[in-house]
């Protein structure tokens, strides 16, 4: 089969287009010439905002390591949104 396609059976008389993983899902196993893409749901703490045949789930940004706080929670399709900490003056 051509690049981007895979055999539909052992006989390989026919080929089908690799599928992509939808937003909220990441690639668990990249397709080969004889097998389709295997997708997995992004677990808590990870996200995918694209439809892709290659992209894995990405971890949420760690706001703390940037000395920021979480302004908007992440989902399986979106990253967290970080913002400045509100520092109270003494």
């Amino acid at each position: 089969c051509e690049e981007g396609w895979h055999c539909t059976s052992e006989a390989c008389e026919s080929c089908v287009l690799h599928r992509s993983c939808s937003p909220g899902f990441g690639v668990k196993q990249i397709a080969t010439g004889v097998s389709d893409t295997i997708c997995e749901p992004c677990p808590v703490g990870f996200f995918s905002n694209v439809s892709s045949a290659f992209e894995k789930c990405h971890p949420w940004t760690s706001c703390e390591t940037k000395d920021l706080v979480v302004q908007q929670a992440g989902t399986n399709k979106t990253d967290v949104v970080c913002g400045p900490q509100d520092r109270l003056r003494a």
């Epitope: 690049e3 059976s9 008389e13 287009l17 992509s20």
Partner: antibody, heavy 115, light 112 residues
């Protein structure tokens, strides 16, 4: 000679389900996926999805997830499509096709949804 | 989803003349493998669709060489030279590069 013989017309009531068939002959059934295509009266073509009889893998157009269920039976070389919770929007001719980009299509099954 | 646009719902033509049918896609149909997955089908009245042309310009088996296809990227054309009465029907373009596969709305060829 490759042939795809589809089941006859169906008149069904709103809310009901219907299951149509596509019997393949003239080739090794498990070597090709079977696609399904919808055509509403006087309108264009819409890809529903495919079933791979070799491993029962299915791939659906998101628009038809929950509406169409694609299956196959190796022993009879037949692919099936079941449509559920029918409405007037589901009234159409449904085609099966061995390889969407190939030359073998069934003659179509007309589904009419009417009270 | 990739949107396939066939701007002309119908084209009238006199037998023996030539006609062109256009199709545009909302994104490029060029795959990273170098192939462009654009197909043309003809649906004659009361019949199932039949493949005419694959990958822009490759004629399907049994299709007369009066039919030809051209284009690249997002713009494609089906040309029929010396139109015959048997050519009447609706012509559809289809993309096969990305799920879900999508068809144009069709262009009806009518004999004047």
């Amino acid at each position: 000679e490759v042939q795809l013989q589809q089941s006859g017309p169906e008149l069904v009531k709103p809310g009901a389900s219907v299951k149509m068939s596509c019997k393949a002959s003239g080739y090794t059934f498990t070597n090709y996926v079977m696609h399904w295509v919808k055509q509403k009266p006087g309108q264009g073509l819409e890809w529903i999805g495919y079933v791979n009889p070799y491993n029962d893998d299915t791939n659906y157009n998101e628009r038809f997830k929950g509406k169409a269920t694609l299956t196959s039976d190796k022993s009879s070389s037949t692919a099936y499509m079941e449509l559920s919770s029918l409405t007037s929007e589901d009234s159409a001719v449904y085609y099966c096709a061995r390889e969407l980009t190939g030359t073998y299509w069934g003659q179509g099954t007309l589904v009419t949804v009417s009270a | 989803d990739i949107v396939m646009t066939q701007a002309a719902p119908s084209v009238p033509v006199t037998p023996g003349e030539s006609v062109s049918i256009s199709c545009r896609s909302s994104k490029s149909l060029l795959h990273s493998n170098g192939n462009t997955y654009l197909y043309w089908f003809l649906q004659r009245p009361g019949q199932s669709p039949q493949l005419l042309i694959s990958r822009i310009s490759n004629l399907a088996s049994g299709v007369p060489d009066r039919f030809s296809g051209s284009g690249s990227g997002t713009a494609f054309t089906l040309r029929i030279s010396r139109v015959e009465a048997e050519d009447v029907g609706v012509y559809y373009c289809m993309q096969h590069v990305e799920y879900p596969f999508t068809f144009g709305s069709g262009t009806k060829l009518e004999i004047k």
